[in-house]
């Protein structure tokens, strides 16, 4: 853990948030598509 406390940086946090947002959008799109196809 050479970066110590700096592992939890804001830039890393922003990247994680962007990934979560993207996954939520993709999963939401798939869910809507599934409902539409029923």
């Amino acid at each position: 853990h050479s970066d110590g406390i700096f592992t939890d940086s804001y830039s890393r946090y922003r990247k994680q948030m962007a990934v979560k947002k993207y996954l939520a959008a993709v999963l939401g799109k798939r869910y809507k598509q599934r409902v539409k196809n029923k």
Epitope: I5, F6, S9, Y10, Y13
Partner: antibody
Framework: QSVEESGGRLVTPGTPLTLTCTVS????????MNWVRQAPGKGLEWIGI??????TYYASWAKGRFTISKTSSTTVDLKMTSPTTEDTATYFC?????????WGPGTLVTVSS | AQVLTQTPSSVSAAVGGTVTINCQSS????????LSWYQQKVGQPPKFLIY???NLASGVPSRFKGSGSGTQFTLTISDLECDDAATYYC??????????FGGGTEVVVK
């Protein structure tokens, strides 16, 4: 994603006091949590940090006076071992390593006889 | 131990004007860039403005600009608005997992 402090109250000098920081929306397993204080009308003062690897670091002036510990998957405590009147302040919990990007509203501690 | 010195302690400028706040460290911050800036209004927690010396936090207007590296850093606020009246703090992260705050700068908007 948020943090909130609790436990602040009026105590007499020498009476130990524990403050709690409760996080929501993220995991302490990957978060660095700081305690920062601010005396009335004064500036911000860093007390210490609990890092994602369960290591704790303190400002030189805070060693022996404060203890930071993770008490559950969502809480980090700050124990004031023997408060003096100089410890009267608003105590903030903040997330981030070397930078503070999520802050709680703070909890007021008054040390007075 | 590292020391962060913020100057001036107070600065006044008119709406539409520009203010510059300096932050000098007694030793280099981590990776020469771990210097952040915060805005605090009375009765509120600090607000995160700038990280790693020059990067704007989410939602912060581009009127706020951070610069510098190593031991010398600057926050510049241009096109001042009444809402910018607050106390501004710098914070440095250091090797050895230490953090320190500057003493703060009060910005008065006329």
């Amino acid at each position: 994603q948020s943090v909130e402090e609790s436990g602040g109250r009026l105590v007499t000098p020498g009476t130990p006091l524990t403050l709690t920081c409760t996080v929501s929306g993220f995991s302490l397993s990957s978060a660095a949590m700081n305690w920062v204080r601010q005396a009335p009308g004064k500036g911000l003062e860093w007390i210490g940090i609990f890092d994602p690897y369960s290591s704790t670091y303190y400002a030189s002036w805070a060693k022996g006076r404060f203890t930071i510990s993770k008490t559950s998957s969502t809480t980090v405590d700050l124990k004031m071992t023997s408060p003096t009147t100089e410890d009267t302040a608003t105590y903030f919990c903040a997330r981030g390593g070397g930078e503070f990007f999520i802050w709680g509203p703070g909890t007021l501690v008054t040390v007075s006889s | 131990a590292q020391v962060l010195t913020q100057t001036p302690s107070s600065v006044s400028a008119a709406v539409g004007g520009t203010v510059t706040i300096n932050c000098q460290s007694s030793q280099s911050v981590y990776k020469n860039k771990y210097l952040s800036w915060y805005q605090q209004k009375v009765g509120q927690p600090p607000k995160f403005l700038i990280y790693q010396a020059s990067n704007l936090a989410s939602g912060v207007p581009s009127r706020f600009k951070g610069s510098g590296s190593g031991t010398q850093f600057t926050l510049t606020i241009s096109d001042l608005e009444c809402d910018d009246a607050a106390t501004y703090y710098c914070a440095g992260g250091y090797s050895g997992n230490m953090v320190d705050f500057g003493g703060g700068t009060e910005v008065v908007v006329k």
